[in-house]
């Protein structure tokens, strides 16, 4: 079944942008001016998820790349990774659970909770130039709030 998708950028609540760091990792850092063109453009898709009153299930792909953010166990710890997929089959309405994030929107701030690992969130560090990761705490040192801006093609 076809899915609704959009193209966007994400910035954390400290206004750090997300950029590629090697082929399979994202990092967060402050960008200005022409450097803003480095930021990753996501293709966010509305997918099937578990029923909820305040969470919207989405998948986060990298625009025009066959890469999706996914959540897997590594060394017994929930971990965020970029995973290659067959572009002929993605995005799809019924995404595998590791690709699904529950988008939680409060006061124009977005959180992305892993559907596979409840209460684990896409996170950034306070420090500059550090990897984007899956964090198990909210409201602590690490940042779990993001803002989204549409990208015009």
């Amino acid at each position: 079944a076809p899915v609704r998708s959009l193209n966007c950028t994400l910035r954390d609540s400290q206004q750090k942008s997300l950029v590629m760091s090697g082929p399979y990792e994202l990092k967060a850092l402050h960008l200005q001016g022409q450097d803003m063109e480095q930021q990753v453009v996501f293709s966010m898709s509305f997918v099937q998820g578990e029923e909820s009153n305040d969470k919207i299930p989405v998948a986060l792909g990298l625009k025009e790349k066959n890469l999706y953010l996914s959540c897997v166990l590594k060394d017994d710890k929930p971990t965020l990774q970029l995973e290659s997929v067959d572009p002929k089959n993605y995005p799809k309405k019924k995404m595998e659970k590791r690709f699904v994030f529950n988008k939680i929107e409060i006061n124009n701030k977005l959180e992305f909770e892993s559907a596979q690992f409840p209460n684990w969130y896409i996170s950034t560090s306070q420090a500059e130039n550090m990897p984007v990761f899956l964090g198990g705490t909210k409201g602590g040192q690490d940042i779990t709030d993001f803002t989204m801006q549409f990208v015009s093609s």
Partner: antibody, heavy 119, light 108 residues
Amino acid sequence: EVQLVESGGGLVQPGGSLRLSCTVSGFSLSSYAMSWVRQAPGKGLEWIGIIYDSASTYYASWAKGRFTISKDTSKNTVYLQMNSLRAEDTAVYFCARERQIFSGDMDGWGQGTLVTVSS
Amino acid sequence: EIVMTQSPSTLSASVGDRVIITCQASQSIDNWLSWYQQKPGKAPKLLIYRASTLASGVPSRFSGSGSGAEFTLTISSLQPDDFATYYCQNTGGGVSIAFGQGTKLTVK
């Protein structure tokens, strides 16, 4: 305060074209999706389509081809281009804001603009 | 495309009555359903989203329930301001968003 104001409605001949505008304030089109919905006289609500970013638009099956939604974020304005108009397109046309991205529901509406297709 | 069917099409009731409007989807939409109220010459107003969550500023006499393909809107004690037309809306089935045909609530 969230405000949406439609304009551009009026009388148009069958086969003609019309472009409606929806100017918004109190929020940014760079982070909210916008739908167009119409209502023929004495009839129910009919969803036309929705725009996210400029490249991501979705339409009701009956609207594909004749109706095009676009936007100019710098002007805070969303447009509905209507071509090959027919008598049955006579309706009040509303723009509406999606409450949250992909929520599908609409928490802010304009007052509507009337389009009459008649010779 | 998913078709939304409301019943009844018209409903006569009195102030203080308990009113129930139903909405059926042609296939399961989980809880992706909203309800709107519309008065003549006005824009619709969002009442309920995700089948059961009350929108901001909506009185608690309104409630929604259901999941899958069967949904209901209940007004526990009808007030004079509630006479209007009510629409259900599928918000999550595929790429398309569809409204029911409406239920007109009139004074008995």
